[in-house]
């Protein structure tokens, strides 16, 4: 028999590519080349991604398989995922904490650390925003608290307190009793 | 460790037969592609033959169509090239070698000398 | 059949040089192409594979280039070891040809 070099591969299915002199099948996400198929429209030989290392996708040219990266606990990341032989490992931020990104154009795979949420009760504000992709936001002061300068602050609980006159519009009816 | 070992050369007459013997060891022989290769003395490397993981496709160099026979046992780890009508230009060594894409791993050879 | 023209066919360098070995194929064999160092009297030795590749164990100075049709080997600081002939061999396409090789010697 001879053999002949044809741009496409005429094989049946259509997961076969060229490699080396023959149309082989590819390997599925998750496994490696070992070998290249030894004839036409033949299978690979292909093996299972060792531990700690994946392929994502099917593939007829990887001869190793990633390493499974590492979240960075100096950013304070947590795993959300394991990593699989089909996935990597998906890093993000644990409750009570959010992702700020290290670069201005942010996209998925840019570089981030986990930050805490604020803490709009601590703040004694409303929430008005859950903390996840962004820090959470606040609102308004709970009831009981005033605007004054950049914080909330407790209505005075007798009249000997001074109230300004931001104070007397929200804790003015405490000043009767 | 891969480990191939070529046997069967010697001196043959024009227009005899020889065959030649490769013993695989340290892989999984029946998922590989396997070819002879040979280099006459002083020359350049030729290849001669290939034969599939199955033994199902064989290709032959058109210098040795006709003439020569590439064939394997995967139950014994062997690869063998059965020689016919052998020429003098057919003196060189051979050497099995095992096929991953390129040839990675190479036997020693064994020599084959046709001269009368 | 591909023709793989190999140049040039003798080299002469000294300990220290980089060297460069050019394939030629005569048609486009993407990069289905292999260098490999053959010592007298022994067998072939697989240094590079898919036309970059190097092989596991095989020392850095040694690389590969090129794709379709033009390819270069490199030893970037020749060792009093690499003393040897290379050859490269494409195998994009059955029958599986080899340049006619590159002697390299100490100058």
């Known amino acids: 028999q001879g053999g002949t070099r044809s741009p496409r591969c005429d094989c049946a299915g259509d997961f076969h590519k060229k490699i080396g002199l023959f149309c082989c099948r590819g390997c599925p996400a998750g496994h490696y080349l070992k070998a290249p198929c030894t004839e036409p429209c033949g299978n690979s030989t292909c093996l299972v991604c060792p531990q700690d290392t994946f392929l994502a996708w099917e593939n007829h040219h990887n001869s190793e398989c990633a390493r499974c990266q590492a979240c960075d606990e100096q950013a304070s990341q947590v795993a959300l995922e394991n990593c699989s032989a089909v996935a990597d490992t998906r890093c993000g931020c644990k409750p009570g904490w959010f992702v700020e990104c290290q670069v201005s154009q942010c996209v998925s795979s840019s570089p981030f650390y986990c930050q805490p949420c604020l803490d709009c009760g601590a703040l004694h504000r409303h929430t008005r925003l859950l903390c996840s992709r962004r820090d959470t936001d606040c609102g308004t002061c709970l009831p009981g608290f005033y605007e004054h300068g950049d914080g909330c602050v407790s209505c005075p609980t007798s009249t000997l307190g001074s109230c300004p006159e931001r104070c007397a519009a929200v804790c003015g009816w405490r000043q009767m009793f | 460790e891969v480990q191939l070992v070529e046997s069967g050369g010697g001196s043959v007459q024009p227009g005899g037969s020889l065959r030649l013997s490769c013993a695989a060891s340290?892989?999984?022989?029946?998922?590989?592609?396997m070819s002879w290769i040979r280099q006459a003395p002083g020359k350049g490397l030729e290849w001669v033959s290939y034969?599939?993981?199955?033994?199902?496709?064989?290709y032959y160099a058109d210098s040795v169509k006709g003439r020569f026979t590439i064939s394997r046992d995967n139950a014994k780890n062997s690869l063998y090239l059965q020689m016919n009508s052998l020429r003098a230009e057919d003196t060189a060594v051979y050497y099995c070698?095992?096929?991953?894409?390129?040839?990675?791993?190479w036997g020693q050879g064994t020599l084959v000398t046709v001269s009368s | 059949d591909i023709v793989m023209t190999q140049s040039p066919s003798s080299l002469s360098a000294s300990v220290g040089d980089r060297v460069t070995i050019t394939c030629q194929a005569s048609?486009?064999?993407?990069?289905?192409l292999s260098w490999y160092q053959q010592k007298p009297g022994k067998a072939p030795k697989l240094l590079i594979n898919d036309a970059s590749n190097l092989e596991t164990g095989v020392p850095s100075r040694f690389s590969g280039s090129g794709s379709g049709t033009d390819f270069t080997f490199t030893i970037s600081s020749l060792q009093p070891e690499d003393i040897a002939t290379y050859y490269c061999q494409q195998y994009d396409t059955l029958p599986i040809t080899f340049g006619q090789g590159t002697r390299l010697e100490i100058k």
């Open positions: 048609q486009d064999i993407t990069n289905y």
């Open positions: 070698a095992r096929y991953s894409g390129a040839f990675d791993h």
């Open positions: 340290g892989f999984t022989f029946s998922s590989y592609g």
């Open positions: 034969i599939s993981s199955s033994g199902g496709h064989t």
